[in-house]
């Protein structure tokens, strides 16, 4: 069964910067990745970035830079302009559309006790939505 993992980390050097890392574990080729916050894409979440393996990336504030890390994983840098750091309590979700498996999505957040620079452990918790 394909699986999606999500890691959220706070940058050690800049407490207002966060990075979301997501990856797809499974066969098939990825056709699209959607990163959202506040919940799953299409279920209360708001799109932060869309990454296509050949067409490029599109992103919306507070996303700063979306990029592919490998052929099956991506990262999204976020810039928190607010002083109270709302990202700390936010859920980030990554949805991978792959062929022929369909869509797989997982969510994760920064652990409450996170020290700057430490990442959350992988949180597959797949929301089983094989669209």
């Amino acid at each position: 069964t394909p699986e999606v993992w999500v890691q959220v980390q706070m940058e050690a050097t800049e407490l207002s910067s966060f990075t979301v890392h997501c990856g797809f574990l499974g066969p098939g080729s990825i056709s699209l990745v959607t990163v959202s916050w506040g919940g799953p894409d299409g279920a209360g979440g708001t799109k932060l970035a869309v990454l296509h393996p050949e067409l490029g990336t599109r992103q919306w504030a507070p996303a700063r830079q979306a990029r592919w890390e490998t052929q099956s994983s991506i990262s999204l840098a976020l810039e928190d302009s607010g002083a109270s750091s709302p990202f700390a309590n936010t859920t980030f979700c990554c949805k991978f559309a792959s062929f022929p498996e369909g869509s797989w999505e997982s969510c994760g957040s920064l652990p409450p006790s996170s020290d700057p620079g430490l990442s959350a452990p992988p949180t597959p918790v797949p929301i089983l939505r094989a669209d």
Partner: antibody, heavy 114, light 113 residues
Amino acid sequence: QVQLVQSGAEVKKPGASVKVSCKASGYTFINNFIEWVRQAPGQGLEWMGVINPGSGDANYAQKFQGRVTMTRDTSISTAYMELSRLRSDDTAVYYCASHWLAYWGQGTTVTVSS
Amino acid sequence: EIVMTQSPPTLSLSPGERVTLSCRSSQSLLSSGNQKNYLSWYQQKPGQAPRLLIYGASTRETGIPARFSGSGSGTDFTLTISSLQPEDFAVYYCQNGHFYPYTFGGGTKLEIK
């Protein structure tokens, strides 16, 4: 099939604002972002920005920041691009496009002239 | 922002000829993570909207004839039309899909000799 139908030609005076509409059909409107590209007479293409119809969030090219506003009305599957403080060099054909610029509207000619 | 430079600005050719259009970007459009180049090519005819031909530097959009092919990596890209048809005479644009804002080249106009 995917279709993007834009509003008609506009003639505006310098300093005024223009709002161009782009009605989408043939796909789920909130699932695909819409981009705006313009083309001055005899010139090349210029990317203006992109809106996520699901949330209404937009990302604008720096050049247009502060003058452009991209919005949408999900109830009628329509995206809008408003450009304010118009100048003569804003005279152009304005296009909306979806699906990573695979589908384009027919274009809206905006003429800015005193 | 990324500057996309196309050359030559105009080309005069005859139907049946092979043509290669050039596009150069001021920064690499290669995504090191997945080894893909985010470069697209568009065709535009007078009075019409642009049409997507090639994306990912070399992938043909659905319905685009096989005579159109794209190649290149990093900062240098080419669009090749193997045998020009009368309907291919148009303006061709390349576009950076990697860095915001997603800039276009100035275009190359193909005209009939």
